[in-house]
Amino acid sequence: KAMHVAQPAVVLASSRGIASFVCEYASPGKATEVRVTVLRQADSQVTEVCAATYMMGNELTFLDDSICTGTSSGNQVNLTIQGLRAMDTGLYICKVELMYPPPYYLGIGNGTQIYVIDPEPCPDSD
C-alpha cells in the first residue's frame, strides 16, 4: 500500500546554478491529480522549496516566482531547480502526493544531495 519514490543520490549543479533530477514514483492507485513538492533538509530542518499540482498527462505548473520548473511523463517527474548558489548545497527531497481520487497516498524520496559550486570570477584582462 505504501508508495515508493526514487530519486538520484547525488547531482552536481551546472556552473550557472541549475540542477536537474528525475523523481519517479510507484503509484499504488490510479491517481488523476498529483502534487509534487521539493523539500530541502539542512541541519534536521525541513523547508519547502517549491510545489506543483498537476493532472496526469498534463504539464507541471509551478508558481511564476518559483525557482523550479518541471515536466511529467507517466509516473516520472523531471525537476529543475534554478538560481542555486554554493550556500544552497544540501539534500533536496522529492515528495509525491496522490491527491485525487481518494484514497490519498504519500511518498517521500530519500533525497538528492545537490552540490553547488559558485563559478570563479573571470580575471580582469590587462
Partner: antibody, heavy 118, light 107 residues
C-alpha cells in the same frame, strides 16, 4: 509561537448540530494541510477529516462521511468542522492538527469537548 | 484500512528503566510511521516521524526503528515525565490510522 486553539464544543442533543473552530497562529496557515482528530473519553485517537492547504482536496473518515463538513478560511487563519446529525458515539474531545511537511501531524491544539446526550 | 496494533497494552516500569513499545501494521506502511506521546488532559505530541527521526525538541532518550510492518519505540532511561500513553500512526495513505495506544505507568 506556533499555536492552534479550538473552540465551539459543548453539549448537544442527538440529531443536533455544532460548528467547531480552530484558530492558527505563528505559522503560514495557508501553506499547510489541516486535520481534525477526535478522542472519545478513555479511548484512543481517531482521525476524522483532512483538508488541503487551498481547500482543493478533502477527505473524511467513513464514520462521519455525509454528516461532517471540513472547511477553512486562509484569510482568517481558521479551520472549521460543521457537525450535523450528531450521535452519542460522536462524543469526544476534538483536536485540530497540522500536517507537517514530512507527513505526520506535528502541531496539535488543546482540544474542545463535544458531548452528544439527551 | 490500515490497522495498527500496539503491544503491550500497559507497561509497568520504574524511572531509569528502558521501555520498548511495539507497533505492527496490517500491511506495509514503509517508513510512514509516527509516534506520539499523550499525557492526561493534554493533546498528543509528536515524538518520532519517518519511523526513526526525532521531532524538533525531542530528547535523544527517545528512538524509533523499523520499516514495513514492524516498528519499535524505545525510551532508554525513563524520566518521571515520560509516564504517559504512546500512540503510533501511519500517514502514508488515507484514512490516517492510529494504534490503540500503550500506557507506560510507574511500577
Amino acid at each position: 509561537e506556533v499555536q492552534l486553539v479550538e473552540s465551539g464544543g459543548g453539549l448537544v442533543k442527538p440529531g443536533g448540530s455544532l460548528r467547531l473552530s480552530c484558530a492558527a497562529s505563528g505559522f503560514t496557515f495557508s501553506s499547510y494541510s489541516m486535520n481534525w482528530v477526535r478522542q472519545a473519553p478513555g479511548k484512543g485517537l481517531e482521525w476524522v477529516s483532512s483538508i488541503s492547504s487551498s481547500s482543493s482536496y478533502i477527505y473524511y473518515a467513513d464514520s462521519v462521511k455525509g454528516r461532517f463538513t471540513i472547511s477553512r478560511d486562509n484569510a482568517k487563519n481558521s479551520l472549521y468542522l460543521q457537525m450535523n446529525s450528531l450521535r452519542a458515539e460522536d462524543t469526544a474531545v476534538y483536536y485540530c492538527a497540522r500536517v507537517g511537511l514530512m507527513g505526520p501531524f506535528d502541531i496539535w491544539g488543546q482540544g474542545t469537548m463535544v458531548t452528544v446526550s439527551s | 484500512n490500515e490497522v495498527l496494533t500496539q503491544s503491550p497494552g500497559t507497561l509497568s516500569l520504574s524511572p531509569g528503566e528502558r521501555a520498548t513499545l511495539s507497533c505492527r501494521a496490517s500491511q506495509s506502511v514503509s517508513r510512514y510511521l509516527g509516534w506520539y506521546q499523550q499525557k492526561p488532559g493534554q493533546a498528543p505530541r509528536l515524538l518520532i516521524y519517518g519511523a526513526s527521526t526525532r521531532a524538533t525538541g525531542i530528547p535523544d532518550r527517545f528512538s524509533g526503528s523499523g520499516s514495513g510492518t514492524d516498528f519499535t519505540l524505545t525510551i532508554t532511561r525513563l524520566e518521571p515525565e515520560d509516564f504517559a500513553v504512546y500512540y503510533c500512526q501511519q500517514y502514508g495513505s488515507s484514512p490516517w490510522t492510529f494504534g490503540q495506544g500503550t500506557k507506560v505507568e510507574i511500577k
